[in-house]
Amino acid sequence: VPPGEDSKDVAAPHRQPLTSSERIDKQIRYILDGISALRKETCNKSNMCESSKEALAENNLNLPKMAEKDGCFQSGFNEETCLVKIITGLLEFEVYLEYLQNRFESSEEQARAVQMSTKVLIQFLQKKAKNLDAITTPDPTTNASLLTKLQAQNQWLQDMTTHLILRSFKEFLQSSLRALRQM
């Protein structure tokens, strides 16, 4: 059960309710577990995980990435700027998570769980953020045309895209987890 659905917390007696930060931490770790399962299927299915083309491939997708200016790294850490970046980044990842649906044969439910759990995570983080006005939501029309373009790719490119999305999303969540633990 995704942590956002709380069933474990309800079932266990004498346990202190999770704080907001603990819930977020748990939610991210749950999504990361899901990504690991999806990556396993992707890497078993194709040789993209060892691809020498990865460096070039980075230029093809505009995937969210943490940079120094985002205030999420230890040097120059800025809680508010970082939180805005995390939420904005997760919102930008949503179109790519939508693309991942139907890309898996044995882990179809896992792909859906990652997508839905990310939506829950965004909600948790939005409650935590003070400066919601600074969060830019991706344009639905732009997202729709991006999705169409990605879905039109050949299978080779779709496998590469899937691998890159999972790898980038994992890195983004790991950076987010480290930053959130400092807040």
């Epitope: 040789n47 093809n60 299978q155 490119l157």
Partner: antibody
Framework: EVQLQQSGPELVKPGASVKMSCKAS????????MKWVKQSHGKSLEWIGE????????RYNQKFKGKATMTVDKSSSTAYMQLNSLTSEDSAVYYC??????????????WGQGTSVTVSS | ELVMTQSPASLAVSLGQRATISCRAS??????????MNWFQQKPGQPPKLLIY???NQVSGVPARFSGSGSGTDFSLNIHPMEEDDTAMYFC?????????FGGGTKLEIK
């Protein structure tokens, strides 16, 4: 040796439908996508669509949606394509082709011999 | 959809000489550093035969006189030296995205 054996020529009446087959051998059928290509007499080639034999999932060229239906039978390693509401425009040679998945590329590397369809009253 | 424009429509080349066929895509067929451009040879009554994939990679068993080059939108197939057996139709094809599209073809003959 990889082989794609297609069914024989078809002479059909306008408005009728036809179902052709493509039997694969020499490789694991479910590991490679199958594509269908149309070649009208003396003309170039047109991609009709492709099917994933493992899942049965398919993608069609918009132009052939409603005209062509691709299916597979995993047990006999055979791909099928049905064409319906035939007109003289559908008279052509239809090829099935396997997709080769190269380290750096993606191409139709093995082709069937083609099925000739003639639509005439 | 990506439109593939092939030229010339027909070409006559003397034995031992060079044949060059060009293909232009309406937009780039490159992605992840790979050009998703393929070249096929077709002889009468036969299915197309893959010669070159990813713009310049020769399929095993294809004679070394066939070579491909180009990237982005402009590609070419070179045959040198021209042999009798090379008389055929040649097609370029992009395999970057659906619908996968072919050039109109080039009829290559002996001069």
């Amino acid at each position: 040796e990889v082989q794609l054996q297609q069914s024989g020529p078809e002479l059909v009446k306008p408005g009728a439908s036809v179902k052709m087959s493509c039997k694969a051998s020499g490789y694991t059928f479910t590991d490679y996508y199958m594509k269908w290509v149309k070649q009208s007499h003396g003309k170039s080639l047109e991609w009709i669509g492709e099917i994933n034999p493992k899942s049965g999932g398919s993608r069609y060229n918009q132009k052939f949606k409603g005209k062509a239906t691709m299916t597979v039978d995993k047990s006999s390693s055979t791909a099928y394509m049905q064409l319906n509401s035939l007109t003289s425009e559908d008279s052509a040679v239809y090829y099935c082709a396997r997709v080769g998945y190269y380290a750096e590329g993606y191409a139709m590397d093995y082709w069937g011999q083609g099925t000739s369809v003639t639509v005439s009253s | 959809e990506l439109v593939m424009t092939q030229s010339p429509a027909s070409l006559a080349v003397s034995l031992g000489q060079r044949a060059t066929i060009s293909c232009r895509a309406s937009e780039s067929v490159d992605s992840y550093g790979i050009s998703f451009m393929n070249w096929f040879q077709q002889k009468p009554g036969q299915p197309p035969k893959l010669l070159i994939y990813a713009a310049s990679n020769q399929v095993s068993g294809v004679p070394a006189r066939f070579s491909g080059s180009g990237s982005g939108t402009d590609f070419s197939l070179n045959i040198h030296p021209m042999e009798e057996d090379d008389t055929a139709m040649y097609f370029c094809q992009q395999s970057k995205e659906v619908p996968y599209t072919f050039g109109g073809g080039t009829k290559l003959e002996i001069k």
